[in-house]
Interface confidence: low
């Protein structure tokens, strides 16, 4: 059987096509090439006559179109109106005609895309943007890259308009992008310069460092704050509730106690529209804001009951601290038997009885902190009494 | 028609050298990043390496990092993989491929995959 | 072991539609787009499906694929006999710096 087949079947604009011819008859007077699906004298492309080895240009002719003495066709720089049915009629000797049709279709080689924006300057969590890749082109695949990644499933992700239109809804500050898209067809492909979203967002909650509360009288007080923000947020400062200055740093040299107080950072975007606070307490004090951890030491961890005493001592180094004992979570002292001595660092259990065996354990403490010590466990132990008859026990 | 034809494959001692070269024809090659491939006796694909359009980045399997060298002269439309202290492990059919899209087209193109295959050296690494 | 996992064999009638599954991470498939690949018997590969779900003139639509998360699968329906060949999943993993393939599948048409 007459059959044609197009060589290659997706061609690129400018390039050349050719109709092959398959199983083509002997004993032949000739064949004709027509555009379209049937025979049609008016869209005759060329005839060939094989006694005289004779080609003639038909109606449909445009100069571009060779015939082969095989009855092959090849049609040369081809444009998208060449995209078609092709049909060949072959004439026998016996001038019976077979005809055979063939297609071939004729994309155009892509230019370089670009993306379009709604709205390049988005708010955070308001706004959605549409990102259109152009130009719209017929027989065309439309393909989104973020990040140089494939778009991930998101439900904020939609794309529509045949994948031409990619819409973010809600952005957020991570949808900056870049954003890239591709068009592709079968015969070429090509990729868009990437486009960057200015996503406008916060401010968020400032942030004032460092982080320390307590400052010795003499120091440079030195406050920084941050606020994520685009555009970046405009701060000012202001102590006690009284504005101070409009910086991110606040600079105070040599403090004094009167520069205790609340420290409050205020951030502004100007495009959002929001504001953001943080208020922060400064504390300028001699006494030391950590504490450290005293030690608690005895004079004996094992007495005998209503003949020994012992003396408990607590140790630290910090200045300008007070002592306080417990013993099993009481305050002490709690008895007569009990005395605190040398600004209570010490005390003193005289005579130590039952109920004094137990945990103790030391406090030391200045106005803005506290420590305490570790434990300490007291036994108290009794002789055993006599045997009624004055022997010893064995 | 777009062609590569893979060359310089055959039986080398362990420890041996040897340079496949990979001829392209049909298409712009300078255009294209390239990759090699290999695939054991029976086993499945295994990607060796990717070289950008230029030569001016460059990717590796692990299993050939610092063994293996892939270059590329555009002006002789040609690839190459130069393969050093080779293994019975490395004993394959090494296929050179290109990628899909053009780099004039593409910022990062070793996501698009490989569209036009060699038909394959076979490297054999056997004392 | 491969980064990529595919089930070793798949079989199916003529006429039939068959499924191939390819497993990955973030990485990979998560966060790019999967390459389908078919190598018939004692050929090189050729190139079956892009980007997740396109394919290259040429190849038959009754080859599709498709994509979900960290997943892809490769559909054929109206098997043929000359579907018969081994089947590959690639895809560009950014953790690795470094293309990676499935085990492949074998397609068995009986």
């Known amino acids: 059987q007459l059959t044609t087949e197009s060589m290659p079947f997706n061609v690129a604009e400018g390039k050349e096509v050719l109709l092959l011819v398959h199983n083509l008859p002997q004993q032949l007077f000739g064949y004709s090439w027509y555009k379209g699906e049937r025979v049609d004298g008016n869209r005759q492309i060329v005839g060939y006559a094989i006694g005289t080895q004779q080609a003639t240009p038909g109606p449909a002719n445009s100069g571009r179109e060779t015939i082969y003495p095989n009855a092959s066709l090849l049609i040369q720089n081809v444009t998208q109106n060449d995209t078609g049915f092709y049909t060949l009629q072959v004439i026998k000797s016996d001038l019976v005609n077979e005809e055979a049709t063939g297609q071939f279709h004729v994309y155009p080689e892509l230019p370089k895309p670009s993306i379009s924006s709604n709205n390049s300057n988005p708010v955070e969590d308001k706004d959605a943007v549409a990102f259109t890749c152009e130009p719209e082109t017929q027989d065309t695949t439309y393909l989104w890259w973020i990040n140089n990644q494939s778009l991930p499933v998101s439900p904020r992700l939609q794309l529509s308009n045949g994948n031409r239109t990619l819409t973010l809804l809600s952005v957020t500050r991570n949808d900056t992008g870049p954003y890239e898209c591709e068009i592709q067809n079968p015969v070429s492909a090509n990729r868009s310069d990437p486009v960057t979203l200015n996503v406008t967002y916060g401010p968020d909650t400032p942030t004032i460092s460092p982080s320390d509360t307590y400052y010795r009288p003499g120091a440079n007080l030195s406050l920084s704050c941050y606020a994520a923000s685009n555009p970046p947020a405009q701060y000012s400062w202001l102590i006690n509730g009284t504005f101070q200055q409009s910086t991110q740093e606040l600079f105070i040299p040599n403090i004094t106690v009167n520069n205790s107080g609340s420290y409050t950072c205020h951030a502004n975007n100007s495009v959002t529209g929001c504001n953001r606070t943080t208020v922060k307490t400064i504390i300028v004090t001699e006494l030391s804001p950590v504490v450290a951890k005293p030690q608690i030491k005895a004079s004996k961890t094992t007495v005998t009951g209503d003949k020994d005493s012992v003396n408990l001592t607590c140790s630290t180094n910090d200045t300008g601290i007070s002592i306080r004992w417990f013993f099993k979570n009481q305050s002490l002292p709690s008895s007569e038997r009990m005395k605190l001595s040398q600004g209570n660092t010490t005390l003193s259990i005289n005579p130590v009885k039952r109920e004094d065996a137990g945990t103790y354990w030391c406090e030391v403490f200045n106005p803005i902190s506290k420590n305490q010590s570790d434990p300490i466990m007291l036994n108290v132990n009794y002789n055993a009494l006599p045997q009624e008859n004055g022997l010893s026990p064995g | 028609e777009v062609q590569l034809l893979e060359s310089g494959g055959g039986l080398v001692q362990p420890g041996g050298s040897l340079r496949l070269s990979c001829a392209a024809s049909g298409f712009t090659f300078s255009g294209y990043d390239m990759s090699w491939v290999r695939q054991a006796p029976g086993k499945g694909l295994e990607w060796v390496s990717w070289i950008s359009y230029g030569g001016g980045s460059i990717y590796y399997a692990d299993s050939v990092k610092g063994r293996f060298t892939i270059s590329r002269d555009n002006s002789k439309n040609t690839l190459y993989l130069q393969m050093n202290s080779l293994r019975a492990e490395d004993t394959a059919v090494y296929y050179c491929a290109k990628d899909r899209l053009p780099q004039k087209a593409v910022r990062h193109s070793y996501a698009n995959g490989m569209d036009v295959w060699g038909q394959g050296t076979l490297v054999t690494v056997s004392s | 072991q491969s980064v990529l996992t595919q089930p070793p064999s798949a079989s199916g009638t003529p006429g039939q539609r068959v499924t191939i599954s390819c497993s990955g991470s973030s990485s990979n498939i998560g966060n790019n787009y999967v390459t389908w690949y078919q190598q018939l018997p004692g050929t090189a590969p050729k190139l079956l499906i892009y980007?997740?779900?396109h394919r290259p003139s040429g190849v038959p639509d009754r080859f599709s694929g498709s994509k979900s998360g960290t997943s892809a699968s490769l559909a054929i329906s109206g098997l043929r006999s000359e579907d018969e060949a081994d089947y590959y999943c690639g895809a560009w993993d950014y953790s690795l710096s470094g293309y990676v393939f499935g085990g492949g599948t074998k397609l068995t048409v009986l």
């Open positions: 980007a997740d779900s």
